[in-house]
Interface confidence: low
Amino acid sequence: QLTTESMPFNVAEGKEVLLLVHNLPQQLFGYSWYKGERVDGNRQIVGYAIGTQQATPGPANSGRETIYPNASLLIQNVTQNDTGFYTLQVIKSDLVNEEATGQFHVYPELPKPSISSNNSNPVEDKDAVAFTCEPETQDTTYLWWINNQSLPVSPRLQLSNGNRTLTLLSVTRNDTGPYECEIQNPVSANRSDPVTLNVTYGPDTPTISPSDTYYRPGANLSLSCYAASNPPAQYSWLINGTFQQSTQELFIPNITVNNSGSYTCHANNSVTGCNRTTVKTIIVTELSPVVAKPQIKASKTTVTGDKDSVNLTCSTNDTGISIRWFFKNQSLPSSERMKLSQGNTTLSINPVKREDAGTYWCEVFNPISKNQSDPIMLNVNYNALPQENGLSPG
């Protein structure tokens, strides 16, 4: 169900409030915010059209409102006149509307708190960090926010000292924040400036882009390597195990088939002392954009169950392709009696059983295209009585 949430519910005068939206439906045309408990065109604050990403102010817009693509509404520099209900109308693609109403209350302001930290440059999975919200005042509620959201339930987060101190045990790279503390009393609320952590981490396993594996002869090969790391990683390249250069990007003009091979990116973080590598295969070839229809053949199409074996062969003239097999719309092999060989071109079933009867086909594919064979029918017979000398029982 569509709901809205005021962050915070009690707002200090002159500050801002964010009307968050939860359970937003999929496939929307847009949203509209209204002042009050119902949809009233004369009290529209702002409308937002998803298709154009355009926000349009309404009659009740004061110039202090901002609508976000996720339907959240930010109201800045609030006054006590802003206290009350706000209604969100969501216009769905099927033109059925949904509505949700929220509210907040504006109070006079407390002093702005600040955050002190015992360590602003921790190491991932090693250090702990304690944040303390200042000043310490009587009859005050202390709240913490991470990434503009209230604290998640986590064994790595601990509150102490009347919630004035927030401790992060064993920080990760996702703990950079920002962190904010908020103090509240019955008549006001205020939030600190954000504090961020510079968490040292990485490098992660690098990724090589673009994702293309196949290149045409004569093309330029331009590869870029990236590994998440703080501080940023240092990179080097190897081709078929031989060092090439210490750069994040590798460029080879006018490539030939001889440039096919294994391209390794090595990423190193001098602070953590860790390094990671990724290997990408590059194939330089004249590859067909659309693979031809493969041909399927069987060593025999009528077999005796529990006695015979059968070989199915998928033939194609295309190069640089992969082959997969299907039986009754299911991918093979599906049992230990089925074996693939010769680069998946041959499917062997030994011995054939009754449940193997039916339609088989193969599919050939490369990174650009795929095509499938016509189906072939395998018939499985069982003899009622054993036969000798090829003679039928009399």
């Epitope: 673009p210 994702s211 290149y215 229809k293 295209s369 095509n371």
Partner: antibody, heavy 121, light 106 residues
Amino acid sequence: EVQLLESGGGLVQPGGSLRLSCAASGFIFSSHGMSWVRQAPGKGLEWVATISSGGTYTYYPDSVKGRFTISRDNSKNTLYLQMNSLKAEDTAMYYCAKHPPDYFAAWFAYWGQGTLVTVSS
Amino acid sequence: EIVLTQSPATLSLSPGERATLSCRANSAVSYMYWYQQKPGQAPRPWIYLTSNRATGVPARFSGSGSGTDYTLTISSLEPEDFAVYYCQQWSSNPPTFGQGTKLEIK
């Protein structure tokens, strides 16, 4: 929302050149193969050119091969069609089309509104 | 190249009637694709991989077929269904379109 906006069409004399552009937004441009498809006035659809997501592969029908060049700039989310040695029979509405992101991208999943090219003396 | 022949060229029916549009290839293809085009508009993908409806296409549309014969069926025509429908293949180079079937109000 996916948007493809073609530009660069117009009137050109036979033998002349024209460069069409297609500005893409609302999707990860570098993950999709892209094509140009044209439609002569009152006629059916005709495929003109295709380029793979990374720009490695380009494909053309015999009718335009050697005269038209498809290219892309993934950093600018833009597709191009350079048309040289234009003929009267190249007169058509030229549509930019997006393929699905998977490797079996043999259909045109989204079309722009087109830009009109008229070749006439 | 593979030639796709659509029939009929024009189909005149009334809302509520069933429509059957045919697309025949001169050589077997693995999949067929269908597009809808209305006057002054760009084509829109309608059916892909023979039988899958594109986003936003109503359930009254269905696609079927294999080999050389493919069909687009509309179970009960609505006013907004009247348009030109094109079939397309790319099982072999070059990709080709049918000449189109114009579905018009009777």
